[in-house]
């Protein structure tokens, strides 16, 4: 069960103790001294580290990916797991640590010169491969957006939204991800009511634009749950 997963102290891939260096005095921006953070200790140790439950990779940290903690485990029980280092096995880009991506099932370094070609090649392969699996996970990757010299325009291959130009987001299209327009007021949006349902979308929509949220369209309140239409509406 999820509880037993979350309460186990014998979980592999634990991150290092949380917490880091304080800001430097005299710098333009420094850590505020003496601030207690609501809801927890400033520093956490391995002993009380709890894996974070998740539905998609984007809910995890940049050095994590979202998956079932046991091989072939219950897909409904997913937690954030530590990313995999170079030469480790992988199924998708998000499983590999920053600076790496998944190629032929192995995490490899994202060499700046060959990076874009490699990614496009990987995506082309997956289009023509009957064994490509829609593995039920979001295709977010922790690769740095600095790998791209220019921001992607609509339809460009991307790995995460920061790879796309302003007003676009990186969303799934078949088994790749491309830059698509952020949704405007009145446009139909996707509200994920069921945990993990992100992974089922082959044609993913962007999120609603700034100042908008995805809500049930007023005249659809009476409709059955399954047919309710959500649109981007002002807060």
């Amino acid at each position: 069960t999820l509880n037993s997963v979350l309460n186990s102290n014998a979980i592999k891939n634990l991150p290092p103790p949380l917490g880091g260096a304080a800001g430097h005095p005299g710098s333009a921006v420094s850590a505020a001294p003496g601030i207690l953070y609501p809801g927890g200790n400033k520093y956490q140790t391995i002993d009380n580290y709890q894996p974070y439950p998740c539905a998609e990779d984007e809910e995890c940290g940049t050095d994590e990916y979202c998956a079932s903690p046991t091989r072939g485990g219950d897909a409904g029980v997913q937690i954030c797991l530590a990313c995999r280092k170079r030469r480790k096995r992988c199924m998708r880009h998000a499983m590999c640590c920053p600076g790496n991506y998944c190629k032929n099932g192995i995490c490899v370094s994202s060499d700046q010169n060959h990076f874009r070609g490699e990614i496009e090649e990987t995506i082309t392969e997956s289009f023509g491969n009957d064994h490509s699996t829609l593995d039920g996970y979001s295709r977010r990757t922790t690769l740095s957006s600095k790998m791209y010299h220019t921001k992607g325009q609509e339809g460009s291959v991307c790995l995460r939204s920061s790879d796309c130009a302003s007003g676009l987001c990186c969303a799934r299209h078949f088994w790749s991800k491309i830059c698509k327009p952020v949704l405007k007021e009145g446009q139909v949006c996707t509200k994920h009511r069921r945990k993990g349902s992100h992974g089922l979308e082959i044609f993913q929509r962007c999120y609603c634009g700034e100042g908008l949220s995805c809500r049930i369209q007023k005249d659809h309140h009476q409709a059955s749950n399954s047919s309710r239409l959500h649109t981007c509406q002002r807060h």
Epitope: A22, G23, A32, G39, E58, G61, T62, S145
Partner: nanobody
Framework: KVQLVESGGGLVQAGGSLRLSCTAS????????VGWFRQAPGKERDFVTA????????AYADSVKGRFTISRDNAKNTAYLQMNSLKPEDTAVYYC??????????????????WGQGTQVTVSS
């Protein structure tokens, strides 16, 4: 290192709206958690809201739920705090803060390493 600058504060009447911006310099912004905190005169600095690196997760203090909305645009290295239905008790200096988002946890429990200088928000009755 990330340097943060807040803007958008000011004087507004009760019931009004303001939008604060937190602009970062430094390429690491897109991999940080960003939080907004506020400090009223003579009081401690309080957590207001936070958003994870991707925008997939947000958290709000009970006192602002339904009125404030946090968002971010990693392409612009900016986070936003949209404040609606403002009340006099929202008067405070608002600080933007950022921390590394390498490992997910409750958004109120991150260590915020970098802080802006703050922007004053005054709500008159």
């Amino acid at each position: 290192k990330v340097q943060l600058v807040e803007s958008g504060g000011g004087l507004v009447q009760a019931g009004g709206s303001l939008r604060l911006s937190c602009t970062a310099s430094g390429s690491a912004f897109s991999s940080t958690v960003v939080g907004w905190f506020r400090q009223a005169p003579g009081k401690e600095r309080d957590f207001v809201t936070a958003i994870n690196w991707s925008g997939a997760r947000t958290a709000y203090a009970d006192s602002v739920k339904g009125r404030f909305t946090i968002s971010r645009d990693n392409a612009k290295n900016t986070a936003y705090l949209q404040m609606n239905s403002l009340k006099p008790e929202d008067t405070a200096v608002y600080y933007c803060a950022a921390g590394r988002d390498r490992y997910a946890r409750d958004l109120t429990e991150y260590e915020y390493l970098w802080w802006g200088q703050g922007t004053q928000v005054t709500v008159s009755s």
